[in-house]
């Protein structure tokens, strides 16, 4: 998930502030950006949110709020200043007309601008099943933990408070930012109004149906009774729930998004700022049968995407459409004929669809996770998701072929036990958006902020890449691939890991230039071997096959063409031990895979020879897939002999600290 | 139809700076990688710098901390900064954009840059 | 970095005559070269690419031929319109991306 991404209108406006005589003019050459949504009929011009740089206070906020106003005026223009934005964002919300917006972009302290847009619910008029492990049956289903040390905040329609299901777990706050319902001859009818929401509070939490039984929830009304909100009312809601954390700090805090609008840097912008804080935000993938990056909340890589599947473990179709997928989605959960709380009666249920329930699952999930480990980081919580859930269960047939490698197949699931997980070694694959086909084309893959890059890879469907190189940016190491001339663009392909105390670094070998082909080890003490990368100039590397893989007695080294430079990624952390496994294959074949054993992870993914058959290298799960072009078009056999070299790792260190816990 | 104008060249004294441009119109820049490509009189050409459709610049160890390239979107146009100009920067610079499966595909008819005392 | 070299210098030919053109990169550039035409006071026109793939609206009697170092550009009869500088230019090791220093065509 990237915030890069998305299919997503950007409008740049390169402005001087030169008229009025601004005491406090952009420096020269800076340009604020104006953004709306890529999807017109979900536009809403005339209100813009106005982002301003990070470190402005808020009387800076009200003093430019104030001074578009004043220049408005001068033009004859009236504005209405909606909500000043302090705590997650510094900004402000306001009503104008579009003619201002060369005016409101010269402004001091601007960063960008975004027209305001629709967001809607994500649900469609078996589950515990599911997700429940092997040893629980579903009509059994009693949680360890039910989720008590957690609090829920659900930002949604309005709720049926007093349901049987949901009474005394769901406390309505009273906040409300919703738009006008559209239509003249709308009824408000308040079991319609209240449907999507008590639902979905019914999922997470209710006494019967729902995931974490124990679980405490708090209701924010951001959908109107068409299931309709907007961008800047989801904004204050969320800045509502940084307020109310900072006032009265309590257990950890889950926020449910089950909505989703099109691609939005300021909502993306948000939910970072709020994951930052701590708070684990889990929302719907989106029901558009479509990439989920196109969309926001769902495309924010802090947020845990959630697309749908049913009880046979497909992709749930919805009319037409159907769940979302793609590199921005992290799992899947039940999604289809859910049954949960209906607001028609204190007592009635309903069966609904969509990423909105899968979404409510996971958050339940989530909370049940979170209570029995309540100092569980975000990003130790999204890889433990990850890791219990049932792997490579969905047909992936049903997604468009070009999603098929980068949509995780994954459902979510309980963990068997809600301790004794510490000792393993958690990573996951974290694809980049796709780089576009010119030369230069580069594609970044990121880790989260307290995850480690353990490793590198690329891959490409036209097999033309110039490899992949692990360097620094902005003092964390990120994945950067390579396109080639006349490629279709690459894919950078990082592999995040969970190492406490690591300490990694980079070493590279330059082109070798020799037969022998172009090796490098880790030569510190103590650093282990935990991935490889290549990265060639040339457009085209000639076929070379080294005499020798690996010396035996030197594991700790990559090894590669002669043209390319290959990088090591070289880790220290205590008890961590890296083994390299290799599975070659003579004869010419689409894919090769080696598996790490049970007890080791993947932590790198290569293949060998780096020559331009090879279309690239990924990890799924753990295990390592080498693709290669068509048989039927590679040439001599000895041209399609592939290897692919898995790193499988595990910390001894790891594994004694929850000994000792137990 | 694609074209590219260049503009800002002159003449300039050794040790000075010069801005040239180079306004695109029949395509968007960004989805490009674009070069500056140079021609001193009677001479061969040499390629100058390229920024590819992702941002990253490239330049030859002859300008490499004299010449920065850049692009504005917006304006659909590709600069080329010039400092510390020296004698041997004389030429006529091109803009040239580069097809995503053809080199050089479509080159601006050049901007003279004249560097003496 | 590669260093492409041209010869002839200069290549004189009678109007319809064919033409034979020679570029050689110091190291193999695969099939990732250029040519390209460049009349006086024009910019370059981009002529061959892949070493063999002709441009779009560039007439039958431009060829290349050649892969790794040595390539040709053969000119089958040579109109007036072809008289000019042809420079080949290596793509595939870069930065830099490099040129020859250029045939020059002219009437015999």
């Known amino acids: 998930q990237e915030d890069e991404d998305g299919d997503y209108e950007e409008l740049v406006l390169a402005l001087r502030s030169e008229e009025d005589g601004l005491a406090e003019a952009p420096e020269h050459g800076t340009t604020a950006t104006f953004h709306r949504c890529a999807k017109d009929p979900w536009r809403l011009p005339g209100t813009y949110v106005v982002v301003l740089k990070e470190e402005t206070h808020l009387s800076q906020s009200e003093r430019t709020a104030r001074r578009l106003q004043a220049q408005a005026a001068r033009r004859g223009y009236l504005t209405k200043i909606l909500h000043v934005f302090h705590g997650l964002l510094p900004g402000f919300l306001v009503k104008m007309s579009g003619d201002l917006l060369e005016l409101a972009l010269k402004l001091p302290h601007v960063d960008y601008i975004e027209e305001d847009s629709s967001v809607f619910a994500q649900s469609i008029p078996w589950n515990l099943e599911r997700i429940t492990p092997p040893r629980y049956r579903a009509d059994e289903y009693q949680p360890p933990d039910g989720g008590s040390l957690v609090e829920v905040y659900l930002l949604d329609t309005s709720i049926q408070s007093d349901h049987r299901e949901i009474e005394g777990r769901v406390m309505v706050t009273d906040f409300e930012n919703v738009p006008e319902e559209d239509g003249t001859r709308f009824h408000r009818q308040a079991s319609k109004c209240d449907s999507h929401g008590t639902h979905l509070a019914g999922v997470v939490s209710g006494r019967d149906a729902g995931v974490a039984k124990g679980a405490s929830m708090r209701s924010l009304r951001v959908l109107n009774c068409q299931g309709k909100g907007t961008v800047s009312g989801t904004l204050i809601g969320l800045e509502f729930i940084r307020k109310s954390q900072l006032v009265q700090p309590v257990g950890p805090l889950v926020v449910l998004l089950p909505l989703a609008g099109g691609y939005s840097r300021v909502l993306n912008a948000a939910c970072q700022r709020l994951a930052r804080a701590g708070v684990v935000l889990v929302t719907a993938a989106g029901n558009f049968r479509d990439d989920a990056c196109l969309y926001s909340p769902a495309s924010a890589p802090e947020v845990i995407t959630v697309g749908a599947t049913n009880a046979q473990d497909q992709p749930v179709t919805l009319g037409t459409l159907g769940t979302n997928f793609g590199r921005c989605v992290d799992l899947f959960a039940p999604g289809e004929d859910i049954i949960g709380a209906s607001s028609d009666c204190s007592t009635c249920f309903v069966s609904q669809s969509g990423t909105s329930q899968a979404a409510a699952h996971v958050a339940g999930i989530a909370a049940m996770m979170l209570s029995a480990e309540p100092e569980l980081t975000l990003a130790e919580l999204r890889q433990r998701l990850i890791h219990f859930s049932a792997k490579d269960v969905i047909n992936e047939a049903w997604f468009p072929e070009d999603q098929r490698v980068l949509t995780p197949n994954l459902v979510a699931a309980l963990p068997p036990s809600t301790h004794g997980a510490g000792w393993q070694l958690f990573c996951r694959t974290v694809w980049s958006a796709h780089s576009g086909p010119t030369r230069m084309a580069t594609a970044v893959a990121r880790c989260a902020p307290d995850e480690e890059l353990l490793s590198c890879s690329s891959f490409s469907r036209s097999g033309k890449r110039r490899g992949e190189r692990m360097e620094a940016q902005g003092g964390k190491l990120v994945c950067r691939a390579h396109n080639a001339f006349g490629g279709e663009g690459v894919y950078a392909i990082a592999r995040c890991c969970l190492l406490p105390q690591a300490n990694c670094s980079v070493h590279t070998a330059p082109p070798a230039e020799a037969s022998m082909g172009t090796r490098v080890h880790c030569h510190q003490q103590g650093h282990v071997l935990t991935g490889c990368s290549s990265h060639w100039e040339v457009e085209d590397l000639g076929t070379h096959k080294p005499p020798v893989l690996r010396p035996r007695g030197q594991p700790n080294q990559c090894v590669g063409h002669r043209e390319a430079s290959i990088h090591a990624s070289c880790c220290h952390a205590p008890g961590l031990e890296c083994k390299v496994k290799e599975h070659g294959i003579p004869a010419p074949q689409e894919q090769v895979t080696v598996a790490c054993e049970e007890g080791w992870t993947l932590t790198g993914c290569s293949a060998l020879p780096g020559t331009s058959h090879v279309l690239g290298a990924y990890a799924v799960d753990n295990t390592c897939v080498v693709r290669s072009r068509d048989v039927s078009t590679t040439g001599s056999t000895s041209e399609g002999a592939v290897t692919a070299v898995a790193i499988c790792c595990r910390s001894r260190h790891l594994a004694q600290a929850s000994q000792e816990l137990q | 139809e694609v074209q590219l104008v260049e503009s800002g060249g002159g003449l300039v004294q050794p040790g000075g700076s010069l801005r040239l441009s180079c306004a695109a119109s029949?395509?968007?820049?960004?989805?490009?990688?674009m070069h500056w490509v140079r021609q001193a009189t009677g001479k061969g050409l040499e390629w100058v710098s390229a920024?590819?459709?992702?941002?990253?610049?490239y330049y030859p160890g002859s300008v490499k901390g004299r010449f920065t390239i850049s692009r504005e979107n917006a304006k659909n146009s590709l600069y080329l900064q010039m400092n510390s100009l020296r004698a041997g920067d004389t030429a006529v610079y091109y803009c040239?954009?580069?097809?995503?499966?053809?080199?050089?595909?479509?080159w601006g008819q050049g901007t003279l840059v004249t560097v003496s005392s | 970095e590669i260093v492409m070299t041209q010869s002839p210098a200069t290549l004189s030919v009678s109007p319809g005559e064919r033409a034979t053109l020679s570029c050689r990169a110091s190291?193999?550039?695969?099939?990732?070269l250029a040519w390209y035409q460049q009349k006086p006071g024009q910019a370059p026109r981009l002529l061959i690419y892949?070493?063999?793939t002709r441009a779009t609206g560039i007439p039958a009697r431009f060829s290349g031929s050649g892969s790794g170092t040595e390539f040709t550009l053969t000119i089958s009869s040579l109109q007036s319109e072809d008289f000019a500088v042809y420079y080949c230019?290596?793509?595939?090791?870069?930065?830099?991306?490099?040129f020859g220093p250029g045939t020059k065509v002219d009437i015999k």
């Open positions: 040239v954009r580069e097809g995503w499966e053809v080199p050089f595909d479509y």
């Open positions: 029949g395509f968007t820049l960004s989805s490009y990688d």
């Open positions: 920024i590819g459709s992702t941002g990253d610049t």
């Open positions: 190291q193999s550039v695969s099939s990732n």
């Open positions: 892949g070493a063999s």
């Open positions: 230019q290596q793509y595939n090791n870069w930065p830099p991306f490099t």
